[in-house]
Interface confidence: low
Amino acid sequence: MATKAVCVLKGDGPVQGIINFEQKESNGPVKVWGSIKGLTEGLHGFHVHEFGDNTAGCTSAGPHFNPLSRKHGGPKDEERHVGDLGNVTADKDGVADVSIEDSVISLSGDHCIIGRTLVVHEKADDLGKGGNEESTKTGNAGSRLACGVIGIAQ
C-alpha cells in the first residue's frame, strides 16, 4: 500500500498550493499537511471529491467522496462523507497553513483517496449545521477555487 500521497492544487485564479498525505499504518490516521496561498482571509471548505477528473476544471470532480452514502458533516462527526475534511483557515496574507490528522480517509482500501480530487472552496463549510438541504450535501462552501488529483508520492 502507498504510505505517502501528494496533491498540487491549482485553479483559474490566484489560489494554489501543495498538500501532503502520510499514513504509516493501513488502519491508522492520515496526516494531511501543506500550504495553500492566494485565498481570502478566513475559513474555506476543504474536501476530497469523488472523481479524479479535472478535464473541465474542478467541476468535473463530482460530489464529495461519499462511499457510505452519508450526509455531509464535519471531520469530527460520525455522520460525514469520507471526504469531509472541514475547513482550512487563511491568514491575513491569504495563506492557509494546513495541518490535519484524519482517521476516516485512507491511502488504501475502501476509503482510499488516491486518484480522487482534493478541492478548496470559496466559502466556509458549515459542517452540515446550516439548516438547509445544501448544508447536508456541500456545507454551503460555495464554488471550487482550486483542486488537484491526489497521487502516490515517493
Epitope: Q16, N20, K31, W33, G34, S35, K92, D93, D97, E101
Partner: nanobody, 130 residues
C-alpha cells in the same frame, strides 16, 4: 540557493535579553511551497536542537517546550529577515545559534527537527552567565 546570515549574538547575564536576526538572500521564489525558517542551537557536546520555527508564507509559529513563553520568533517579509527575541535568558540557553531554512511543507511534530532544514547559516554565539 538561499544564503542565511545570523547576527545579534553575544554575552549576557542570566535574566537578560538578546535579539537575534537572520537575513535570507538569493534563491528562487517557488510557485507553491514557501519556506519554513527556524532557529536552532547547539550547546558544547550536545546535539543540535530546534528552538523555534516560523512559516514564512503565513503566520504559523512553533516553539520547543524549553523556550515557550520566553522566546518569540517573528519576521519582516519585506526584508526577508527572521528574528528571535530571547527574554529571561538562562545559563542553559548558552550555545551556538543557527538560522535554517526548509523548502517544503513540514508535518506536525517535525517542524523543529533539524533534518527538515536544508540551508543553514554559519551561526552566532550566545553565552549566558549566572
Amino acid at each position: 540557493q538561499v544564503q542565511l546570515q545570523e547576527s545579534g549574538g553575544g554575552s549576557v547575564q542570566a535574566g537578560g535579553s538578546l535579539r537575534l536576526a537572520c537575513v535570507a538572500s538569493g534563491g528562487d521564489t517557488r510557485p507553491y511551497i514557501t519556506y519554513w525558517m527556524g532557529w536552532y542551537r547547539q550547546a558544547p557536546g550536545k546535539e543540535r536542537e530546534g528552538v523555534a520555527t516560523i512559516y514564512t508564507g503565513g503566520s504559523g509559529t512553533y516553539y520547543s517546550d524549553s523556550v515557550e513563553g520566553r522566546f518569540t520568533i517573528s519576521q519582516d517579509k519585506a526584508q526577508r529577515t527572521v528574528y528571535l527575541q530571547m527574554n529571561d535568558l538562562k545559563p542553559e540557553d548558552t550555545g551556538m545559534y543557527y538560522c535554517a531554512a526548509g523548502n517544503g511543507a513540514l508535518p506536525p511534530g517535525r517542524r523543529l527537527s533539524p533534518q527538515n532544514m536544508d540551508t543553514w547559516g554559519p551561526g552566532t554565539q550566545v553565552t549566558v552567565s549566572s
